[in-house]
């Protein structure tokens, strides 16, 4: 069951091309940039979205000129390598033949270096932090209504199990959702934490990846709960090695 | 108030197939997934499998792979599970359960379906 | 898949005496100190009713005399008094890992 057969759409993944071309005439979608076949009753993996969104055609915007002053962020944005699976490869290199290693999320965990640069193994980050901080509100929100709408939202839209949501944490206006997974733990067709955060991210910023679905509409008990930032803390399970120039 | 409505007792032929019907009320249909759970006369509960009623799709327990369909109807939230081939062992009460918010308990069930499988 | 074992099969009380039902699972249940263990309430020709959810929360309604314990694979439901209503089958429930699986029940009759 990998795409909707009515209209033939991906309804994890709007960043793809479907057509009945699959198996007996079945809806067979690909990942746009990849050209991957992606299985659409769950969720894709972020590294084969990323590259989907690399490749995505632009909208043409007014340029506005930023102020001397402003700090650049990039949102972790490159065209990453992706494997057979769609999981990311340990080495990412650009198109200047800069190279480093990443975690299975993608995010950079040594220092850069060139073509010669090895990184053995993909690292799995099995500890991710995700820090919300909510718009202010009549009120705090109760906790263990907060926790539970978060943990339904996480295994009914994300398809990820609560047990890998170790804990929601909060201290009015600060959210905290701890998402731990070791692999030991993730069992064939559990979703894995980082391609579920990345969804949510994705969610929050209003820059949903869901076919045709309206934006997330986060509500508990009826309240509107509204995210103003959100910072993501990645751990892995072998630590980072960067050089101590970098830290200073 | 929240509330599952199943469909009325059956009574069927061995090899034959049959189809319970549970339609929600009292809350957003797609926000919570609906389980089936059966029970044998005089026996325990037993899990079928749960259906997505966002995606629509569904996961099984491996003892009823291949017998047993679920499937959802968004218009008229009602959700439905297709039990084929049945045999006598298959008679029981069957129950459909939704999820609860936040760690997969059950926290509203259905009345029960009773199905006979009788020749 | 997790067997879930109650014990005792039959637990034959008064009311106003204290009920102690016992779930021991085959392998662990919890996740970072989330344990996967649900507790229900079946009469006859009734579905089962919710009581306690991960093996300590009480569900909404439910009286405060019904409460759950223990961690891992060791659970315990304790009625602090038994009210005449209470006579029924108690099952215990994992829902950490698919097929969820059910305990055999204990049924708690009035002596």
């Known amino acids: 069951h990998t795409a909707a057969q009515d209209n033939c759409t991906c309804p994890t993944n709007k960043m793809t091309v479907c057509s009945p071309d699959g198996p007996g005439g079945r809806c067979q979608c690909r990942a746009l940039g990849s050209g991957m076949a992606v299985d659409c009753s769950t969720l894709t993996s972020k590294c084969l979205l990323l590259k989907a969104r690399m490749s995505a055609p632009k909208n043409a915007r007014t340029l506005v000129r930023p102020s001397e002053h402003a700090l650049v962020d990039n949102d972790g944005l490159y065209d990453p390598d992706c494997d057979p699976e769609g999981r990311f490869k340990a080495r990412q290199c650009n198109q200047t033949s800069v190279c480093w290693c990443v975690n299975s999320v993608g995010v950079r965990r040594t220092d850069k270096g060139d073509l010669s640069l090895r990184c053995d193994e993909l690292v799995r980050t099995h500890h991710i932090l995700i820090d919300l901080r909510h718009r202010p509100t009549a009120g705090a929100f109760n906790h263990s209504d907060l926790d539970a709408e978060l943990r339904r939202l996480f295994r009914e839209r994300y398809r990820l199990h609560p047990k890998f949501v170790a804990a929601v944490h909060y201290e009015q206006p600060t959210i905290q959702i701890e998402l731990r997974q070791n692999t030991s733990q993730k069992a064939a067709g559990d979703v894995d934490i980082g391609d579920a955060a990345y969804y949510f991210e994705r969610d929050i910023k209003g820059e949903s990846l869901f076919q045709g679905r309206g934006g997330l509409d986060l509500r508990v008990r009826g309240e509107p709960l509204q995210v103003e930032r959100t910072l993501i803390y990645y751990l892995d399970e072998i630590p980072p090695k960067f050089s101590m120039k970098r830290l200073t | 108030q929240v509330q599952l409505v199943q469909s009325g007792a059956e009574v069927k032929k061995p090899g034959a197939s049959v189809k319970v019907s549970c339609k929600a009320s009292?809350?957003?249909?797609?926000?919570?997934?609906i389980n089936w759970v059966r029970q044998a006369p005089g026996q325990g509960l037993e899990w079928m499998g749960v259906?997505?009623?966002?995606?629509?799709?569904?996961s099984y327990n491996q003892k009823f792979k291949g017998r047993v369909t679920m499937t959802r109807d968004t218009s008229t939230s009602t959700v439905y599970m297709e039990l084929s081939s049945l045999r006598s062992e298959d008679t029981a009460v069957y129950y459909c359960?939704?999820?609860?918010?936040?760690?997969?308990?059950?926290?509203?069930w259905g009345q029960g379906t009773l199905v006979t499988v009788s020749s | 898949e997790i067997v879930l074992t109650q014990s005792p099969a039959t637990l034959s009380l008064s009311p106003g005496e204290r009920a102690t039902l016992s779930c021991r699972v085959s392998?662990?249940?919890?996740?970072?100190?989330?344990?996967?263990m649900h507790w229900y309430q079946q009469k006859p020709g009734q579905a089962p009713r919710l009581l306690i959810y991960?093996?300590?929360n009480l569900e909404s309604g439910i009286p405060a005399r019904f409460s759950g314990s223990g961690s891992g694979t060791d659970f315990t439901l304790t009625i602090s008094s038994l009210e005449p209503e209470d006579f029924a089958v108690y099952y215990c429930?994992?829902?950490?890992?698919?097929?969820?699986?059910f305990g055999g029940g204990t049924k708690v009759e009035i002596k």
């Open positions: 359960a939704r999820y609860g918010d936040g760690y997969n308990q059950f926290d509203y």
């Open positions: 009292g809350y957003t249909f797609t926000d919570y997934s």
């Open positions: 392998e662990s249940v919890d996740s970072y100190g989330n344990n996967f």
């Open positions: 429930q994992q829902s950490y890992e698919d097929p969820y699986t």
């Open positions: 991960r093996a300590s």
């Open positions: 259906i997505s009623t966002y995606y629509g799709d569904a």
